[in-house]
Amino acid sequence: QGQDRHMIRMRQLIDIVDQLKNYVNDLVPEFLPAPEDVETNCEWSAFSCFQKAQLKSANTGNNERIINVSIKKLKRKPPSTNAGRRQKHRLTCPSCDSYEKKPPKEFLERFKSLLQKMIHQHLSSRTHGSEDS
């Protein structure tokens, strides 16, 4: 049940990431740590790296408010049901600084990819023999 809540939150975050991708030109063009091909059991650690990254609005045009609201939603901490499990893996997972830094567009694409991976793993884990390749 707790894990379901987490994954439902991940699904909602995908929509927020997609929204922010529409405003990529209004984000500060700063390079940010962007985990990719995250090893098994380090997904939560990588997720927290994405959340900690300093994604910022460039404060130009009419989109500043919607961008700031979306960034705030991205950074909202998930329920702490799995805090213990996440802490346990954090010691053996790469530090945020060790991940390749990417501009906002690629950062958001990689964030979305991680969210998709986590949801897909959750869905597959609830189904026997669902993964075909």
Partner: antibody, heavy 117, light 107 residues
Framework: QVQLQESGPGLVKPSETLSLTCTVS????????WGWIRQPPGKGLEWIGY???????NYNPSLKRRVTISVDTSRNQFSLKLSSVTAADTAVYYC???????????WGQGTLVTVSS | DIQMTQSPSSVSASVGDRVTITCRAS??????LAWYQHKPGKAPKLLIY???SLQSGVPSRFSGSGSGTDFTLTISSLQPEDFATYYC?????????FGGGTKVEIK
């Protein structure tokens, strides 16, 4: 805005292989999940399966033996092959994108495939 | 497989009416439910995901609720463009499965 368009023969003979292609425009196929859903005449929707941009697949167990879904990122297309078809495979076939893995946010308009000799 | 049962199979309503469609899962699916609108010859359209989240660009007259096995799609004030068939779909486990559909017709 992502758009999807199904293409392929509208008539397939029994025992042959049904082949359909979905062309994606307005977005890249190199992220997200890409699926096929069908609707037999007068019936509900049936999920056939989907493929991730990286090539991992999930198929409906009821069709698994006969289905192959593949992706061609260079052409921004993905494909469905359904072997050994019978009249029961007559349906409107839809391709769709799943950004959220669990639901389909963009669909093609569908293409009717009739299985008949 | 998880079976999805929709009711009613059809409903006649007038513009401005409040319309409620229900979907029942054969086992608990938490909030892993989506709702679609489908018009003949058109591409189906995602309305709601994870039971109650409104898809971007969908009018706020559409709302979803429920968790576990029982779910509801509500159209608060039916508009002419809302006459269509509505489907629910579960995503708690593979295979993803759809309800049989509810046709919303003009009274």
């Amino acid at each position: 805005q992502v758009q999807l368009q199904e293409s392929g023969p509208g008539l397939v003979k029994p025992s042959e292989t049904l082949s359909l292609t979905c062309t994606v425009s307005g977005g890249s196929i190199s992220s997200d999940f890409w699926g096929w859903i069908r609707q037999p005449p007068g019936k509900g929707l049936e999920w056939i399966g989907y493929i991730s941009s990286r090539g991992s697949t999930n198929y409906n167990p009821s069709l698994k033996r006969r289905v192959t879904i593949s992706v061609d990122t260079s052409r921004n297309q993905f494909s469905l092959k359904l072997s050994s078809v019978t009249a029961a495979d007559t349906a409107v076939y839809y391709c769709a994108r799943s950004a959220g893995v669990t639901d389909f946010d963009f669909w093609g308009q569908g293409t009717l495939v009739t299985v008949s000799s | 497989d998880i079976q999805m049962t929709q009711s009613p199979s059809s409903v006649s309503a007038s513009v401005g009416d409040r319309v409620t469609i229900t979907c029942r899962a054969s086992q608990g699916i938490s909030s892993w439910l989506a709702w679609y609108q489908h018009k003949p010859g058109k591409a189906p359209k995602l309305l709601i995901y994870v039971a109650s989240s409104l898809q971007s660009g969908v009018p706020s007259r559409f709302s979803g609720s429920g968790s576990g096995t029982d779910f509801t799609l509500t159209i608060s004030s039916l508009q002419p463009e809302d006459f269509a068939t509505y489907y629910c779909q579960q995503a708690a486990s593979f295979p993803l499965t759809f309800g049989g559909g509810t046709k919303v017709e003009i009274k």
